[in-house]
């Protein structure tokens, strides 16, 4: 390294050091930079800007130092191509500000900005918070106000310094399949930069038409389907302080539907069902045509669903220790204000021990069982039984 007379010289297997004064005005296209993990730049007064594509190809970079140079602008997306960057030292440059977007998405362990003429403004509120909350090793000198003798200003107490306020207005009336729905995103705040909708969850649920611009964005969902339920519609906005977003879900009403499966023996017996509808339907079970009163021996149990973005619910009519008196026809009635549906299934859990040939002796040692009961209960279980 001592004999290297290039602008930038290698340091170890994956480092590069650029310290020959006044030889660099851009970091774009550094030779042999593919596997760099460490880049050190010093005494480059003509290096004034760090732009979006300057660090392209430096995907392995972990540490970047640009010190005692002329850096006065770092683009918000300057580190787009260096997602692994963890150490950033930009001390002793000409930076007056640094956008929160610049470091968004990076897992910085330390950030050094001392020796820069940083001007106190809302755009640096994020930096002050990092320092106060010790979010990573942040090293700056006191932020300067515009007056020559101003000390560090308590930006947090400046009410005009804040991320945008975002609200989505929705229709008050119930929405039905086939309707068009208009949503309005109202944004308030200082120095608003941009705002938009995030509609990734809505594919195939409706045709989407965006309208308007800051501070009021419109979104029309044309010919909505029931698939729109439980899907997030998100509006976001950014200013120089940060980003805010809010999500809503449009509830699309549709009639109840129900499906029953064959009884299966698990740790207990289960008559599986699926119900759908919006609003969520009320459920009622019938056994051989009569209302089934649930007890700890026979009751509805919903399955925990990993899918929170659908209206369909799955569950079991759970039967603990069913006997022959529980054999029969089970009907599930699901109803909501838009309609009702029913499904039935025959279930046989155990043979009736009292079915006998008239010529067989009568089993007098057994008392008759109340065959109207629906809370009777066999089946050894391995798990805890509710």
């Amino acid at each position: 390294a001592a004999s290297c007379r290039e602008t930038c010289c290698p340091v170890g297997p994956s480092g590069l050091r650029c310290t020959r004064a006044g030889t660099l005005n851009t970091l774009r296209g550094l030779r042999g930079a593919g596997n760099l993990t460490e880049l050190y730049v010093e005494n480059q007064r003509d290096l004034q800007r760090l732009e979006f594509e300057d660090l392209q190809g430096l995907g392995e970079l972990r540490s970047l130092t640009i010190v005692k140079s002329g850096l006065r602008f770092v683009a918000p997306d300057a580190f787009h191509f260096t997602p692994r960057l963890s150490h950033l030292n930009l001390s002793s440059n000409a930076l007056e500000s640094l956008s929160w977007k610049t470091v968004q998405g990076l897992s910085l362990q330390d950030l050094t900005l001392s020796g820069n003429p940083l001007h106190c403004s809302c755009a640096l509120l994020w930096l002050q918070r990092w320092e106060q909350e010790d979010l990573c090793g942040v090293y700056t000198q006191k932020l300067q106000g515009s007056g020559s003798g101003d000390q560090f200003l308590p930006l947090g107490h400046n009410n005009s310094c804040g991320v945008p306020s975002v609200k989505i207005q929705m229709p008050n009336d119930s929405v039905e399949v086939g309707d068009d729905v208009f949503l309005q995103c109202q944004v308030e705040g200082q120095a608003l930069q941009q705002a938009d909708w995030i509609l990734t969850e809505l594919e195939g649920t409706a045709t989407m038409k965006k309208s308007g611009d800051l501070p009021s964005l419109g979104l029309t969902l044309v010919n909505v389907t029931s698939d729109l339920n439980k899907k997030n519609v998100t509006c976001w906005a950014e200013n120089d302080v940060g980003r805010a977003e809010v999500s809503v879900q449009v509830s699309v009403s549709f009639p109840a539907s129900v499906h029953l499966g064959k009884a299966v023996e698990q740790h207990h017996w289960c008559i599986p069902f699926s119900v759908d509808g919006q609003p969520a339907p009320s459920l009622r079970w019938f056994f051989n045509g009569s209302v089934l009163n649930e007890t700890s021996f026979i009751f509805t149990q919903f399955l925990e669903s990993a899918l929170t973005n659908e209206t369909m619910r799955h569950g079991c009519l759970r039967l603990n220790q069913p006997t022959h008196v529980n054999n029969g026809n089970y009907t599930l009635l699901a109803a909501n204000p838009y309609g009702q549906a029913a499904a039935s299934i025959m279930a046989a859990f155990m043979d009736n021990p009292f079915e006998f040939n008239p010529e067989d002796p009568i089993p007098v040692s057994f008392s008759p069982v109340d065959t109207n009961s629906t809370s009777r209960d066999p089946v050894e279980k391995k798990d805890e039984t509710p």
Epitope: S296, Q301, Q321, T323, P378, P386
Partner: antibody
Amino acid sequence: QVQLQQPGAELVKPGASVQLSCKASGYTFTSYWIHWVKQRPGQGLEWIGEINPNNGLTNYIEKFKNKATLTIDKSSNTAYMQLSGLTPEDSAVYYCAKYGNYVAFAYWGQGTLVTVSA
Amino acid sequence: DIQMTQSPASLSASVGDTVTITCRASENIYTYLAWYQQKQGKSPQLLVHNTKTLAEGVPSRFSGSGSGTQFSLKISSLQPEDFGTYYCQHHYGVPLTFGAGTKLELK
């Protein structure tokens, strides 16, 4: 491990009401019915009723339908039994209990002694 | 409601003895019967469910038998910790009912 925690004792006046609590831990509270059992001093065990913590559905034995009210607070994993119009006959230990791996009471609270006295 | 009748109401025995407690149901409950032990001032403890399946941690000197309406709990070679009150309970639907109890005392 599964635990059902109950306060030790309650002293109440005749005609008043009392609310007994049963705080559950160590299992998924909403998946298992909670039962309540009465035991008068020197007497046997008497099932009062049951409640499904998932939806608040209740079943009572006939004689307790106007005496006991079972409720649930899902946020604190706690079951409650309110006893109203108390008389000296209501003086007893009240247990909460739940099924284990089968339909029998593998888990019991320590019981709350309710004394009805002027 | 199913009535459970337990006998005897009380029983005196010595350490090392074998004793049997019986329970009768007012109707057929198949094998859906449980037994509990209760010591003075303590909560009941499950011993047996489904007539003869021992609950976790219950010593093998306890055994249950029966079906339909007649059931029994047998304790072989009584130990000092076995003295207390024993209850049967059907688990064949709601409402659940218990026997009146059998008090097992040291002779």
